[in-house]
């Protein structure tokens, strides 16, 4: 008799998930000498242990602690770039500006980026058919809890001036329900972080509005200032030129406003 399987609203575990995580871990530790000591089999075992045989709506941050411990990594705390709803540009930026780091430039972020995973209660199976959706099913699912855990730790580690890249094309440039708005903002430590600098990325070529005056940016400023952290904001009117000037800062066109 075929065993009844829970149908969730979200997509199932990414195919070849174990192999992908292991391969990414090996690749990352080869490229980053400071992480060469990491045993990728142990990392996979800890990752697997966080969600296998557990109800996928009942995952806690504690479940991920063994993985967090193995993935402990020191990044320069004053070189952190957060992002919200504009991941690709943030990653393009840190690929050029190699001394700055997004969460996905760390081992744990790199392992899980763009992947989905979940298990089933009381079986050692990975569910490749469906996984819980954050809105439609439950928020304490393996993927959401993972990102909440690593995002919290990443924000807590930040110091001095922290940068955040925000998508100026969205109706809510700052969305308090995003990972940045609900986790990272609230875990920047006022004792260490002096300023949060927002970079608002414009979408349209003819868009000359000052998006730093957007009500959602004012809301971000309010949340940040209440934490006793200074706030500043810059419009990035031409993201293509912005990246080009990061690559070639000596270019004569890079002295004008981007």
């Amino acid at each position: 008799v075929p065993r009844w399987r829970q149908q969730w609203s979200g997509p199932g575990t990414t195919k070849r998930f174990p192999e992908t995580v292991l391969a990414r871990c090996v690749k990352y530790t080869e490229i980053h000498p400071e992480m060469r000591h990491v045993d990728c089999q142990s990392v996979w075992d800890a990752f697997k242990g966080a969600f296998i045989s557990k109800h996928p709506c009942n995952i806690t941050e504690e479940d991920y602690q063994p993985l967090m411990k193995l993935g402990t990594q020191t990044v320069p705390c004053n070189k952190i770039l957060l992002w919200s709803r504009i991941k690709d540009l943030a990653h393009q930026f840190t690929q050029v500006q190699r001394d700055m780091f997004t969460l996905e430039d760390t081992l744990l972020g790199y392992l899980a980026d763009d992947l989905t995973w979940c298990g089933e209660f009381n079986t050692s199976k990975i569910n490749y058919q469906s996984c819980p959706d954050w809105r439609k099913d439950c928020s304490n699912n393996p993927v959401s809890v993972f990102w909440k855990t690593v995002s919290r730790r990443f924000a807590e580690a930040a110091c001095d001036v922290v940068h955040v890249m925000l998508n100026g094309s969205r109706s809510k440039i700052f969305d308090k329900n995003s990972t940045f708005g609900s986790v990272e903002v609230h875990n920047l430590q006022p004792e260490k972080v002096q300023t949060l600098e927002a970079w608002v990325i414009h979408g349209g070529r003819e868009d000359s509005r000052d998006l730093c005056q957007d009500p959602t940016i004012k809301e971000l400023e309010s949340i940040i200032s209440k934490r006793n952290i200074q706030f500043s904001c810059k419009n990035i009117y031409r993201p293509d030129k912005f990246l080009q000037c990061v690559k070639n800062p000596e270019d004569s066109s890079c002295t004008s406003e981007i």
Partner: antibody, heavy 125, light 109 residues
Framework: SLEESGGDLVKPGASLTLTCTAS?????????MCWVRQAPGKGLEWIGC????????IYYASWAKGRFTISKTSSTTVTLQMSSLTAADTATYFC???????????????????WGPGTLVTVFS | DMTQTPASVEVAVGGTVSIKCQAS??????LSWYQQKPGQPPKLLIY????LAASGVSSRFKGSGSGTEYTLTISGVECADAATYYC????????????FGGGTEVVVK
């Protein structure tokens, strides 16, 4: 509306928990929910606030840290736990909502627009 | 923290009264004014330094200021304006002793 409860006559050194219950709105829209006290014949004294969108953002007056704890206990209740009470803590305790001031519930300092009637805490020996 | 002056002021009906509030650091115009009458909770009058809080608040109440210096002006004072007025900063909740000023009692003659 807001209503505070839990005020009482207590002895020095005692602990007490006050509850603030919201009706007509809930915390699924994010607010700063604040506690303010007023000793008899004195001015308003800010105790602290909790951002209802994140339990990581709780703020206290410097004098209140350690002895006072603010928590969101449900989508309509916030509590204030007080310990090691002294006669100086005798006051009316108010719960207040720091309202959103922009469109679509953006919070950027709209002031405390909604207050409870207050609950009296008396510390006596 | 917030320094409010004067502590008490007497004003005749129809007169004008100004209450000042000084912040220890810039508060970005995130300042509110409240009116409190005996036995009642405070009532929000003005937010963001100059915006009237609700349609029920009389336009006789006017807020102004920026940076660290703010003023509440009540013109055409009425008997019903007799109350204690408080300013409150909403800019930073870190390392704050009191977000409220000490209060100003307005006595109407």
């Amino acid at each position: 509306s807001l209503e505070e409860s839990g005020g009482d006559l207590v002895k020095p050194g005692a602990s007490l928990t006050l509850t603030c219950t919201a009706s007509g709105f809930d915390f699924t829209t994010y607010y700063y929910m604040c506690w303010v006290r007023q000793a008899p014949g004195k001015g308003l004294e800010w105790i602290g606030c909790i951002y209802t969108g994140s339990s990581d953002s709780i703020y206290y007056a410097s004098w209140a840290k350690g002895r006072f704890t603010i928590s969101k206990t449900s989508s309509t209740t916030v509590t204030l736990q007080m310990s090691s009470l002294t006669a100086a803590d005798t006051a009316t305790y108010f719960c207040a909502r720091d309202r959103p001031s922009g469109n679509d519930d953006y919070i950027y300092d709209g002031g405390m627009d909604l207050w409870g009637p207050g609950t009296l805490v008396t510390v006596f020996s | 923290d917030m320094t409010q002056t004067p502590a008490s002021v007497e004003v005749a009906v129809g007169g004008t009264v100004s209450i000042k509030c000084q912040a220890s650091q810039t508060i970005n115009s995130w300042l509110s004014w409240y009116q409190q009458k005996p036995g009642q909770p405070p009532k929000l009058l003005i937010y963001q330094a100059s915006k009237l809080a609700a349609s029920g608040v009389s336009s006789r109440f006017k807020g102004s200021g920026s940076g660290t210096e703010y003023t509440l002006t009540i013109s055409g004072v009425e008997c019903a304006d007799a109350a204690t007025y408080y300013c409150q900063q909403g800019y930073s909740f870190g390392n704050v002793d009191n977000a409220f000023g000490g209060g100003t009692e307005v006595v109407v003659k």
